[in-house]
């Protein structure tokens, strides 16, 4: 008799197989919080960039990638205090003289209003009400994202 | 009548409220190789170490984390040409001079024999029969993972 | 109880050195930037530098660069002001503060030790 | 540098009097001020950040407002505790973090 986690196991199997989905998030995990199609987690130490960035990736998710000017809002109504400073998966990349998301796409100028440098070694953070460009040497906090809802297609076969 | 995708979820969440897990894969997404408890990506592009470790972020994973000299040789097996080499998620601190892993702990020596230097900006990769420091700016492949089975207790509260 | 102590004040010669030593308590000291602040005899305040929470950065103005040391020990909940080629005017209290958390660089002082005085006379 | 110039120099008040201090960067500074108070032989105490955001446990009487180059502490009923020298400082993330020259609040 197999448990109904087991049971899953072989239901979502057959569900990949048929539709190539990555086995998602159905629930956000404890700690973190529901935005939309998205778990995201606020953390409470600070770090450079870098250190938050590998922070996220061993927590088996991603610095926070912002999709448009309306989800920076949502997400910027979750923090609480008007100075504190998260950083997010975008950095400023010194070859492409752009700001670039850590998925390799590139900021639409239009989605975030920068306040600060684009610069070498610059990265971004927001606030409650503002983008910055801060140093990635910076020590503050940070947002991990993980996707909610399976992603039909999401095969990842290679960047 | 809900689909069994649909009753999977009710009863993973069962699960995950009864024991604090977090909602862990139940099987490896298309492309990802099974070792064990995890699921690997082996990258057939090149990257520096910093991208390396920003791509297996936004694909929510960690670049590879090695537990011991066991683990190791069974990555290695893996790896079909003798040449080549990945990066993992091990690199050099220097306010710490010591190797640390992306998740903050250190290396305990005895675990992997490193070729090369413990030096500012080196980071550390595999080939089939070795494993080596390298210049973090080197483009080479790299090893993302993920976690196969759900971890107990395993909760994120914060880093 | 949260606070600051700072100690290691006293009169010194011009040419001379000091190290002004700042114990915190009642938080997370690893978490903070943290900062040295003085303030001459009936003047106002002046920033001389300050150590990012894991001691990797740090900052110093232009008026003390080069004679003056910030360092911290998280294990002992302590931060620390080297000073050498004291100067007469380097006569001030000096306090330690610490910034608001996450705020990064930018450093707001929410809260200071009571000061301590360095007199640079001959 | 930023300069940063507080103005008046000193003000006599009255209890229940509205004080207002401005405080003058050189160059732009988005939102980035801090109000402090400082009693005789006392550390300063953050009253304001962010420009506007009241520091926990200072009492509402006291407010911050201003963006950009031109800011300003309003204390809307002196109290007879308030009496001190009020000093702004620049945040921007970029040492110096320099203070302005302060502004004495007295007694009338």
């Known amino acids: 008799q197999k448990s109904s986690i087991e049971k899953c196991s072989v239901d979502i199997q057959q569900s990949r197989n048929k539709t190539t989905e990555r086995p998602g998030l159905l629930n956000c995990p404890i700690y973190w919080q529901q935005l939309r199609e998205k778990c995201l987690l606020f953390s409470h130490t600070v770090n450079p960039w870098n250190n938050s960035l590998a922070d996220c990736s061993t927590k088996e998710s991603s610095l926070l990638l912002i999709r448009d000017k309306d989800e920076l809002i949502h997400t910027q109504n979750l923090i609480r205090d008007k100075a504190i400073l998260f950083w997010i998966g975008l950095n400023f990349s010194l070859s492409e003289k752009n700001w670039k998301w850590i998925n390799g796409s590139f900021l639409n100028s239009n989605d975030l209003e920068i306040r600060g440098d684009a610069k070498e070694n610059s990265c971004i953070s927001i606030s409650q009400t503002s983008v910055y460009s801060e140093y990635c040497s910076t020590e503050i906090r940070w947002i991990c994202q993980k996707e909610l809802t399976p992603v039909r297609n999401k095969v990842y076969p290679d960047s | 009548q809900k689909s069994s995708i649909e009753k999977c979820s009710v009863d993973i969440q069962q699960s995950r409220n009864k024991t604090t897990e977090r909602p862990g894969l139940l099987n490896c997404p298309i492309y990802w190789q099974q070792l064990r408890e995890k699921c690997l990506l082996f990258s057939h592009t090149v990257n520096p170490w910093n991208n390396s470790l920003a791509d297996c972020s936004t694909k929510e994973s960690s670049l590879l984390l090695i537990r011991d000299k066991d683990e190791l040789i069974h990555t290695q097996n893996l790896i079909r040409d003798k040449a080549i080499l990945f990066w993992i998620g091990l690199n050099f601190s220097l306010s710490e001079k010591n190797w640390k892993w992306i998740n903050g702990s250190f290396l305990n020596s005895n675990d992997l024999e490193i070729r090369g230097d413990a030096k500012e900006n080196s980071c550390i990769s595999i080939s089939q029969t070795s494993v080596y420091s390298e210049y973090c700016s080197t483009e080479i492949r790299w090893i993302c993972q993920k976690e196969l089975t759900p971890v107990r207790n395993k909760v994120y509260p914060d880093s | 109880q949260v606070q600051l102590v700072e100690s290691g004040g006293g009169l010194v010669k011009p040419g001379g050195s000091l190290r002004l030593s700042c114990a915190a308590s009642g938080f997370t000291f690893g978490q903070y930037y943290m900062s040295w602040i003085r303030q001459a005899p009936g003047k106002g305040l002046e920033w001389v530098s300050y150590?990012?929470?894991?001691?990797?950065?740090?900052a110093y103005a232009d008026s003390v660069k080069g004679r003056f040391t910030i360092s911290r020990d998280n294990a002992k909940n302590s931060l620390y002001l080297q000073m050498n080629s004291l100067r007469a005017e380097d006569t001030a209290v000096y306090y330690c503060a610490r910034s608001l958390m996450s705020t990064g660089t930018h450093l707001y002082f929410d809260l200071w030790g009571r000061g301590t005085l360095v007199t640079v006379s001959s | 540098d930023i300069q940063l110039t507080q103005s008046p120099s000193s003000v006599s008040a009255s209890v229940g009097d509205r004080v207002t201090i401005t405080c003058r960067a050189s160059?732009?500074?988005?939102?980035?001020l801090a109000w402090y108070q400082q009693k005789p032989g006392k550390a300063p105490k953050l009253l304001i950040y962010?420009?506007?955001s009241l520091q926990s446990g200072v009492p509402s009487r006291f407010s911050g407002s201003g963006s950009g180059t031109d800011f300003t502490l309003t204390i809307s009923s002196l109290q007879p505790e308030d009496f001190a020298t009020y000093y702004c400082?620049?945040?921007?993330?970029?040492?110096?973090?320099?203070f302005g020259g302060g502004t004495k609040v007295e007694i009338k």
């Open positions: 962010a420009a506007s």
């Open positions: 150590i990012s929470p894991s001691g990797a950065t740090i």
């Open positions: 400082q620049q945040v921007t993330s970029f040492p110096p973090y320099t």
């Open positions: 160059q732009g500074i988005s939102d980035w």
